[in-house]
């Protein structure tokens, strides 16, 4: 019976109307000839939010998204016709849905779209400095987008552009069957995962990709892909989905005789996010929806936040699980999954593992191999047939930090902000849902810092109509949250301290790390501020101790609904 299992009522529940009236949301309601505002790129330096949508790319001012520039990038009528001839929907499919939007260098972005089932990429000039105010498409230089953007707008691409090379997890064919992780652009030959081998990838849906250093030597850097895929037969009875983390070495250039132009360091492991059921059978949240990496002081060890939902049609639920990279690395250094025995089931591989261990990056740190092309044949052969790890990655504390079950919505997106409060640092989660609401949740340590309690601070409706939130970015500089959906883009501040009430008690009871009672109002808390009058208690929300100045006259209803 988890504390985080309680469907705790939000301290504040704000409707779209209330959000508008209190100036707590700014919305861009989309253009008549566009939709699908799903692909976000935040540029804090230029103070811009770039958004890829249907036939358009936008550049929004982070201060106020009402101020924006746009690039129109449709497909030619001929491409549109071909797409229509292929039996596709002229409005929902036969357009250029932007799926990749990444910083390419100091002056350009790289963008790819579905191109009406004919993926296409190009460069966008944004200038050297914010004041240049440049935002234009390089229409003289289009590139084939195959292996970069999917053909089908319903599919996602997980991508990462580093050192002029694009890593992307996507579908590389018209039918949406050839899913792969690619590396394209750059000076090297494109590299991909093994084709038509369900042991490597089994109808995956890619979520995100991240570069995480392995050591102080950049040669050891790895790219991690988060995705969900069908469980391989024998791994599970019946059709099931598994959440996955996959790794590849940044300096993987494929094999020499075998796995030529294919990854030689690809490994994947299952991510578990589950709660024990009353009958001893765990309830699994397997449908990975989104991932957020919270950087720590050590760049090698960010905390991974994952949003999951259940696969079941009967039982609808969502969960947030946290993972440590040290646990991930431990699994990748553990036993490989191997099929054996009379029922050909998955078992941990017990035989001799070739040297250097498959999945290790060629570098001075872990062994004497300069390139994956120099790897011995037995390493390549083993890597080809053993892409999966036997052990799964369990979440921190072996359980979700938050679950929601008896509600009519599911989680879709997550961003996390680390906030300095009076009594320490807190991670504040902003969780997007499939009904256009955002939950603001703080993780509060109970007896120990490991045992966390979730406090649901706010539930905000950010779009006029219920719509799935498909993108979220958080600007620490602007202290704003940006949200994308099919309908448009919304912007809201990370905190609304004044809404918590007019008394110290209410401010304290709110337990919002952003807010503190300053003697006369509930306002933004700054740890650097010298004022000793600041009253705040995130850990316990105890106004009696902290509001001894007679400011307890406000209502002390912990579940106060703001209407």
């Amino acid at each position: 019976n988890y504390a985080n299992g309680k469907n705790n009522v939000p301290r504040l529940k704000l409707s779209y109307k209330e959000m508008l009236e209190s100036n707590n949301v700014i919305t861009f309601n989309g253009l008549a000839n566009s939709s699908s505002y799903h692909t976000f790129l935040l540029d804090e330096e230029r103070s811009r939010l770039y958004v890829g949508a249907k036939d358009h790319i936008f550049s929004f001012n982070l201060v106020n998204i009402k101020d924006f520039q746009k690039i129109v990038w449709p497909v030619s009528y001929t491409r549109r016709d071909e797409c229509k001839w292929a039996g596709k929907d002229i409005l929902k499919e036969c357009a250029n849905f932007i799926k990749v939007l990444k910083a390419y260098n100091q002056t350009h972005l790289y963008a790819c779209g579905t191109g009406a089932f004919h993926p296409i990429c190009t460069y966008i000039e944004v200038g050297h400095h914010p004041e240049d105010n440049i935002f234009k498409l390089q229409d003289s230089h289009f590139e084939n987008g195959r292996g970069k953007s999917p053909y089908d707008p319903k599919l996602l691409t997980a991508s990462l552009l580093i050192d002029g090379e694009l890593y992307s997890g996507t579908a590389a064919d018209f039918m949406g069957r050839d899913f792969a992780i690619f590396r394209t652009l750059g000076h090297h030959h494109p590299i991909r995962t093994e084709q038509h081998d369900s042991r490597w990838l089994n109808d995956p849906r890619f979520i995100s990709a991240h570069l995480i250093p392995e050591s102080d030597n950049p040669e050891d850097d790895k790219v991690y892909f988060f995705f969900r895929e069908n469980a391989i037969d024998g791994e599970h009875s019946g059709k099931a989905t598994h959440a996955r983390i996959g790794q590849i070495c940044k300096n993987d250039f494929g094999g020499h005789r075998s796995l030529v132009n294919k990854w030689t360091t690809f490994l994947k492991a299952r991510l578990i996010c589950s709660v024990p059921g009353p009958n001893g059978i765990d309830t699994h949240f397997d449908e990975l929806q989104d991932v957020f990496l919270m950087n720590s002081k050590d760049p090698k060890n960010p905390i991974v936040y994952g949003v999951f939902t259940t696969s079941s049609n009967i039982f609808k639920g969502s969960a947030v699980c946290m993972y440590s990279m040290s646990d991930v690395r431990r699994v990748f250094l553990g036993p490989y999954a191997h099929r054996d025995g009379p029922n050909y089931q998955w078992v941990p591989y017990q035989g001799r593992v070739p040297y250097p261990r498959p999945g290790t990056c060629p570098s001075k740190t872990f062994g004497g191999f300069d390139s994956t092309k120099d790897l011995p044949d037995d390493v390549i052969t083993f890597a080809r047939s053993h892409p999966a790890m036997y052990n799964p990655v369990f979440p921190i504390n072996n359980r979700p930090i938050m679950i929601k079950t008896d509600v009519n919505y599911q989680f879709t997106q997550i961003v996390v902000d680390r906030v300095d409060a009076e009594d320490g640092q807190y991670d504040v989660m902003f969780i997007g849902t499939d009904v256009g609401t955002v939950l603001k949740v703080v993780s509060v340590p109970k007896e120990t810092w490991h045992d966390l309690e979730e406090v649901l601070l706010e539930e905000m409706t950010v779009f006029r109509e219920p719509t799935t939130i498909s993108a979220m970015e958080l600007s620490t500089k602007q202290q704003q949250l940006y949200i994308g959906s099919t309908a448009g883009v919304a912007q809201l501040p990370l905190h609304r301290c004044d809404i918590y009430g007019k008394a110290c008690a209410e401010c304290c009871l709110a337990r919002d790390p952003y807010c503190a009672w300053d003697g006369s109002s509930c306002s933004r808390y700054f740890p650097t501020a010298k004022a000793r009058t600041r009253a705040q208690d995130i850990r316990n929300g105890d106004p009696l101790t902290h509001c001894s100045d007679g400011g307890i006259e406000g209502r002390m209803d912990h579940h106060h609904h703001h209407h």
Partner: antibody
Framework: EVQLLESGGGLVQTGGSLRLSCAAS????????MSWVRQAPGKGLEWVSW????????YYADSVKGRFTISRDNSKNTLYLQMNSLRAEDTAVYYC?????????WGQGTLVTVSS | QSVLTQPPSASGTPGQRVTISCSGS????????VSWYQQLPGTAPKLLIY???HRPSGVPDRFSGSKSGTSASLAISGLRSEDEADYYC???????????FGGGTKLTVLG
């Protein structure tokens, strides 16, 4: 200059097979869908089949479905039409055409005669 | 029997304006772009008009296309002897999932 050159036509018995080829040049072949259109002697044009630029999708007229197979080799800039179980009514000049929302370039055609 | 209906023949004298009609249905002309093709005797067809009314480069502006509802037409003004050819209309048919042509119109330039 866009050029399409068909080959492989000829005389064939009913029930026989034939493979037509179309060599393309003067444009980025791998970027365009391609099609076959035929014209029976003294008759009008009839669309036969088309193929997506990356072979991802193929479409056929009902009259040839199950007997004809369209394919392409983008590395060789060549389009193919494998014709099996040929009938007398398949006798026609077969044109290879570049698809660009319509048939914007045509080859000179190759004659296929099916005799009974 | 062609899905798109064209008159089998048309004629005119040099300098005259001639119009060729093409009628179809909502599944082809009504909801898809119409193209016109010219086939000179003994040669391959050539694209004359695309997207209802657009001319590819190199096609004289004497040729124009238009569309209304489920019918389209090709107009040739200032008729010349070299315009003597077969003219075909074409469009994608959504219900047949295929491209359809008209039966063709044989244009004769008299005199």
């Amino acid at each position: 200059e866009v050029q399409l050159l068909e080959s492989g036509g000829g005389l064939v018995q009913t029930g026989g097979s034939l493979r037509l080829s179309c060599a393309a040049s003067g444009f980025t072949f791998s970027d365009y869908a391609m099609s076959w259109v035929r014209q029976a002697p003294g008759k009008g044009l009839e669309w036969v089949s088309w193929i997506y630029y990356d072979s991802g999708s193929k479409y056929y007229a009902d009259s040839v479905k199950g007997r004809f197979t369209i394919s392409r080799d983008n590395s060789k800039n060549t389009l193919y039409l494998q014709m099996n179980s040929l009938r007398a009514e398949d006798t026609a000049v077969y044109y290879c055409a570049k698809l660009n929302g319509d048939f914007d370039y045509w080859g000179q055609g190759t004659l296929v005669t099916v005799s009974s | 029997q062609s899905v798109l209906t064209q008159p089998p023949s048309a004629s005119g004298t040099p300098g005259q304006r001639v119009t060729i009609s093409c009628s179809g249905s909502s599944s082809n002309i009504g909801n898809n772009d119409v193209s016109w093709y010219q086939q000179l005797p003994g040669t391959a067809p050539k694209l004359l008009i695309y997207a209802d009314s657009h001319r590819p480069s190199g096609v004289p502006d004497r040729f124009s296309g238009s569309k209304s509802g489920t019918s389209a037409s090709l107009a040739i003004s200032g008729l010349r002897s070299e315009d003597e050819a077969d003219y075909y209309c074409g469009a994608w048919d959504s219900s047949l999932s295929g491209y359809v042509f008209g039966g063709g119109t044989k244009l004769t330039v008299l005199g």
